[in-house]
Interface confidence: low
């Protein structure tokens, strides 16, 4: 019967031919009486055998990642009679694994938006890296991934590759951040190959600001011929959140004469101070009045950012209008 | 590697209409935007809209709107821009660009433009 | 009037490094990612940079991209003379609701 034992080539070998062992018949007293041959695809061009002996030997570099067998026919024949010494037989020959493939992030770019101020541990995103190596050979595909870029903001479960918050984030402050994450395989030791990739993490707002006037003190000047209904200035907050949560309303706070009111332009975000009841510049020819803002929609959760209403005093004088 | 081929020229007279296709290949088209850019001789580029071929959603440039109509045909991983009440002022290379999978994520592919001549 | 200002030309000779600015506003640069394409003449645009300073596959690390609050800039080191182009950056504008290019900026190598 043939005798053999498993065969392995090892990848990527540099050696022009290197032996992978032995094919013979147990019939074979080593006269040279025998000749074997080598059938099937990759034989003469890619292994060859010794037609007195049965070696077998790889003459070309191998690739596992393109092929990771060879599945081959053996043939024994006595050269004297030129028949089969025994039947033709199949055998295989496996390419082992050398780490020869670094981690790879195939679904790149990796683009995520987190809400602003979210806790530590939030999720942000998962990266996954793919090794081409034989994740069966020992740790050539076992991955763990480090954080090369993103402290102290954000961290990653070295087995997973989930990439959470570790520190919470202001997006007035900074809006988009860019986690630079490492894939490593051989689970980090010696011979390891690597792999980076780029996320990049996008701040969305949060309605953590309250709007604050830009002026302490505004002078405005009201005719007294002005009919009621009459716009006589604006006065304008900011609000370093943008969007729905920069959206505000403005109202009177303090306005003992009843005289005034303030209107929301929601275009603009400017409150427009209008004329009430008409005023008389011989009854009195000025007034003082109090003005707060709020912002439009707070959600329960964010109303400890929005406890004290910024306010501004308005100062308005009367013009005098000769009268008949 | 991603592919988008693009219709061919196409002359037409003031006031007609143009419809431009654009087919994608190499992707799973349903999972990105595609928008329409043109660039009239000699000038810059200018986008005039953007479609998401899943759901058809479409945003168009405001100097186009009411003109310009944005269509997407999932079978056949095409999508079309049709552009009417044609002035030679449109005279210009249309081109569709694979945008990402959000909104503002840039274009890394684009067709090789179609010339359409507007003249009477 | 193009929303992202960029100058019409530039120039520079081989070896050279040559910056191309880009300015918007709050609204489009100074909420979004930036990206920069390259247009050969007679040829499709070309995705250069994107998310601000990210190369594609196949770009030379001579491109880079960068960004500070409203505006951009693109920088060609060791200037060829095949990167004589057309050079646009395109940003998305949350006020518009759509893509904003700039006008372009001709870039011109000489001997």
């Known amino acids: 019967g043939w005798v053999w034992n498993q065969f392995f080539v090892p990848e990527e070998m540099n050696t022009t031919s290197h032996h992978i062992g032995q094919l013979r018949s147990d019939l074979d007293n080593g006269n040279n009486s025998f000749q074997y041959k080598l059938l099937g695809a990759g034989a003469g061009s890619t292994f060859i055998i010794d037609e007195r002996t049965g070696d077998i030997y790889a003459i070309q570099k191998l690739d596992r990642e393109e092929r990771s067998l060879y599945i081959l026919r053996a043939q024994v024949i006595d050269i004297a009679t030129g028949r089969a010494v025994e039947p033709e037989s199949e055998f295989v020959i496996k390419v082992s694994d050398i780490n020869d493939n670094e981690p790879k992030f195939l679904d790149e770019p990796y683009e995520a938006i987190v809400p602003e101020m979210s806790p530590e541990g939030t999720l942000v995103i998962q990266v996954t890296a793919s090794d081409a190596d034989d994740p069966s050979s020992g740790n050539n595909a076992r991955l763990l991934y480090s954080l090369l870029q993103g402290q102290p903001y954000f961290s990653v479960e070295p087995t997973t590759g989930v990439i959470r918050i570790s520190s919470k984030m202001d997006r007035e402050l900074q809006d988009e951040y860019w986690v630079i994450i490492q894939a490593k395989d051989m689970i980090g030791q010696p011979g390891a190959l690597s792999g980076t990739t780029s996320v990049l993490i996008k701040l969305s707002d949060v309605n953590d600001n309250k709007p604050i006037f830009k002026e302490s003190l505004y002078r405005l000047t009201v005719s007294e011929s002005a009919p009621t209904g009459t716009s006589i200035g604006t006065i304008m907050a900011y609000d370093n959140d943008i969007g729905e949560n920069a959206e505000m309303d403005y109202s009177i706070e303090e306005d003992d004469s009843q005289t005034f009111d303030i209107i929301t332009n929601h275009e603009t975000q400017e409150g427009i101070v209008i004329l009430k009841k008409k005023v008389d510049f011989e009854h009195q020819n000025h007034y003082g009045i109090r003005a707060k803002v709020k912002n439009h929609h707070v959600p329960e959760q964010l109303m400890k950012y929005h406890t004290e209403a910024s306010t501004t005093f308005i100062k308005i004088q009367v013009e005098d209008v000769d009268e008949p | 590697q991603v592919q988008l081929v693009q219709s061919g020229a196409e002359v037409k007279k003031p006031g007609a209409s143009v419809k431009v296709s654009c087919k994608a290949s190499?992707?799973?088209?349903?999972?990105?935007?595609m928008s329409w850019v043109r660039q009239a001789p000699g000038q810059g580029l200018e986008w005039m809209g953007i479609i998401h071929p899943s759901g058809g959603d479409t945003t168009y440039a405001q100097k186009f709107q009411g003109r310009v109509t944005m269509t997407g045909d999932t079978s056949t991983s095409t999508v079309y821009m049709e552009l009417s009440s044609l002035r030679s002022e449109d005279t210009a290379v249309y081109y569709c660009?694979?945008?990402?999978?959000?909104?503002?994520?840039?274009?890394?592919?684009w067709g090789q433009g179609t010339l359409v001549t507007v003249s009477s | 009037q193009s929303v992202l200002t960029q100058p019409p030309s530039a120039s520079g000779t081989p070896g050279q490094r040559v910056t191309i600015s880009c300015s918007g506003s709050?609204?489009?640069?100074?909420?979004?990612?930036v990206n920069w394409y390259q247009q050969l003449p007679g040829t499709a645009p070309k995705l250069l940079i994107y998310t601000n300073n990210q190369r594609p596959s196949g770009v030379p690390d001579r491109f880079s991209g960068s960004k500070s609050g409203t505006s951009a800039s693109l920088a060609i080191s060791g200037l060829q003379s095949e990167d004589e182009a057309d050079y646009y950056c395109?940003?998305?504008?949350?006020?518009?609701?759509?893509?904003?290019f700039g006008g372009g900026t001709k870039l011109t190598v000489l001997s």
């Open positions: 709050r609204s489009n640069i100074g909420s979004n990612f």
């Open positions: 395109a940003v998305y504008d949350e006020s518009l609701q759509g893509w904003v």
């Open positions: 660009a694979r945008g990402g999978i959000k909104l503002w994520l840039h274009f890394d592919y």
């Open positions: 190499r992707y799973t088209f349903t999972s990105y935007y």
